[in-house]
Interface confidence: medium
């Protein structure tokens, strides 16, 4: 009688993560008597996957009923496949022995490859805000995919970026892989509404790439421009001075009025107007009682924006031309908030 052969007809099997893998194996004879075992890998370190003789293998089911007489189909199904299951599986026939069964013949092996989807890309920007014209770095990470081949692209507002570096790890064979990419982006004053997008394409995604986004509003700081102007006199001895704070982002801003270097009033930007580009404008004004001054007054609008060092703009107020009003020692009226802010 012809010697038993163990036939594994599939050289390779490709399965998506979470699905069931079928590993086929048949024997050409019932003789010699003895069980079939399945292993992952070869050699001394091989891992037992299924033993027909004994043991508990909750993820493994046999394709046919192995208790049926004359059964020679020893195919198995492995459920809930993960990338960690990838490897070469061998169907091995043992000859019944005492006390131990003896390995008789092995199949040629079936390589199980697992297709696993990449995780949703996570895009992270710099820890601190940066101002326009500066170059900032964004990172994109995605994990757990297999096979290794993957494509990553960067976009800013739909325009593809070219200044980036990408690594897929590990370099050698692995059950699953990770991708890490760093892109450099030059900020402009118009970037408050801008988005940076990392797009990952993989065979498991069937042409529908995964995207991760970062809003540049989290990254950019647009410093304000200041303009201090003197408005027409509201009363015979009063002058209205405004400080226009324009094109700033984010909104966090504190303004201090100084009269000849002395703090007159401090306020925080609350109700602001938003520009189309996402930056903000704000105006503060000060009523100066010129009759309280014998000399010219230097008015300074000092702005501290988003925790940065203060910037300021000054205005020299000429008071010699105005008559002095006796009995008044008030240099400036601290007006109500809705008077002081001009919208």
């Amino acid at each position: 009688e012809e010697e038993l052969q163990v036939i594994q007809p599939d050289k390779s099997v490709l399965v998506a993560a979470g699905e069931t893998a079928t590993l086929r194996c048949t024997a050409t004879s019932l003789i010699p008597v003895g069980p079939i075992q399945w292993f992952r890998g070869a050699g001394p370190g091989r891992e037992l996957i299924y033993n027909q003789k004994e043991g508990h293998f909750p993820r493994v089911t046999t394709v046919s009923d192995l208790t049926k007489r004359n059964n020679m189909d020893f195919s198995i199904r492995i459920g809930n496949i993960t990338p960690a299951d990838a490897g070469t599986y061998y169907c091995v026939k043992f000859r019944k022995g005492s006390p131990d069964d003896v390995e008789f013949k092995s199949g040629a092996g079936t390589e199980l490859s697992v297709r696993a989807k990449p995780s949703a890309p996570v895009v992270s920007g710099p820890a601190a805000r940066a101002t326009p014209q500066h170059t900032v770095s964004f990172t994109c990470e995605s994990h757990g995919f297999s096979p290794r081949d993957i494509t990553l692209k960067w976009f800013k507002n739909g325009n593809e970026l070219s200044d980036f570096q990408t690594n897929v790890d590990p370099v050698g064979e692995s059950v699953s892989y990770s991708i890490h990419s760093t892109a450099k982006v030059v900020l402009t004053r118009e970037d408050v509404h801008s988005q940076v997008i990392c797009e990952v394409a993989h065979v498991t995604l069937q042409g529908d790439p995964l995207r991760g986004t970062a809003n540049l509003s989290e990254t950019i700081r647009v410093p304000p421009t200041l303009e201090v102007t003197q408005q027409p006199v509201r009363a015979e001895n009063q002058v209205n001075v405004t400080c226009q704070v324009r094109k700033f982002y984010p909104q966090r801003l504190q303004l201090t009025w100084l009269e000849n270097g002395n703090v007159s009033r401090t306020e925080t930007a609350s109700t602001v107007t938003e520009n189309k580009d996402g930056t903000y404008n704000w105006m503060s004004w000060l009523l100066v009682n010129v009759s309280a001054h014998r000399d010219d007054v230097k008015l300074t609008c000092q702005v501290e924006h988003d925790g940065q060092p203060a910037v300021s703009k000054s205005h020299d107020l000429k008071v010699s031309a105005h008559p002095k009003e006796q009995g008044s020692n008030t240099a400036a009226e601290n007006t109500g908030s809705n008077e002081r802010n001009i919208y």
């Epitope: 019932l30 079939i36 003789k53 192995l66 049926k68 059964n71």
Partner: antibody, heavy 126, light 105 residues
Framework: VTLDESGGGLQTPGGALSLVCKAS????????MGWVRQAPGKGLEFVAA???????EYGAAVQGRATISRDNGQSTVRLQLNNLRAEDTGIYFC?????????????????????WGHGTEVIVSS | AVTQPASVSANPGETVKITCSGS????YGWYQQKSPGSAPVTLI????KRPSNIPSRFSGSKSGSTATLTITGVQADDEAVYYC???????????FGAGTTLTVL
């Protein structure tokens, strides 16, 4: 189905015996055949079986001393037992398997017997 | 090894279950011997198959590595030694259990 054993009797220790089972009433070549024995006052003990492809199995007590063979033309199965011991004394039954081949990757000759002979007595004594 | 109880007893008409613990992957046979040295009779082979000449009150089943012979409506004539046969779970060698003596009270 009829199974007739022969060849028993008084045997001397260290000697050899040859038991023959003549089968009739079924297609002999299609079925596994075996031998089971029972020592005085003891239970049943598997001795040997021969399967469809002439693959043989032997019980632990006779391993290395027994040879089972079959002649499909004569519808006979033979058990040769060498180096006889006193503990080989007992009644030897010929047994027919319910089928051919194996299941579960194993041919368990004791789980699928569907017919028995009446037995032949073997006494090993000096 | 194949393990079965040494003895069981029952009143006529009762149901008797005799268990046999052995291999989880193999099948089981059940054999009745009325007297020592007499030819055994096959009641069940391949775990649950009954020869045509055996009454239906004899049935076999298996759960995990334990097989059960069930005799419903036990009769006085059922007094005998019952052997289970299977394979040794470690060596795969074909073996018999030590036998279970059924006494009908």
């Amino acid at each position: 189905v009829t199974l007739d054993e022969s060849g028993g009797g008084l045997q001397t220790p260290g000697g050899a015996l040859s038991l023959v089972c003549k089968a009739s009433g079924f297609t002999f070549s299609s079925f596994n055949m075996g031998w089971v024995r029972q020592a005085p006052g003891k239970g049943l003990e598997f001795v040997a079986a021969i399967y469809s492809g002439n693959s043989a199995e032997y019980g632990a007590a006779v391993q290395g001393r027994a040879t089972i063979s079959r002649d499909n033309g004569q519808s006979t199965v033979r058990l040769q037992l060498n180096n006889l011991r006193a503990e080989d004394t007992g009644i030897y039954f010929c047994a027919k398997d319910a089928g051919s081949g194996c299941y579960s990757g194993v041919c368990a000759g004791t789980s699928s017997i569907d017919a028995w002979g009446h037995g032949t007595e073997v006494i090993v004594s000096s | 090894a194949v393990t079965q109880p040494a003895s069981v007893s029952a009143n006529p008409g009762e149901t008797v279950k005799i268990t046999c613990s052995g291999s989880s992957s193999g099948s089981y046979g059940w054999y009745q011997q009325k007297s020592p040295g007499s030819a055994p009779v096959t009641l069940i082979y391949e775990t649950n198959k009954r020869p045509s000449n055996i009454p239906s009150r004899f049935s076999g089943s298996k759960s995990g590595s334990t097989a059960t012979l069930t005799i419903t409506g036990v009769q006085a004539d059922d007094e005998a030694v019952y052997y289970c046969g299977s394979e040794d779970s470690s060596t795969y060698l074909s073996i018999f259990g030590a036998g279970t003596t059924l006494t009908v009270l």
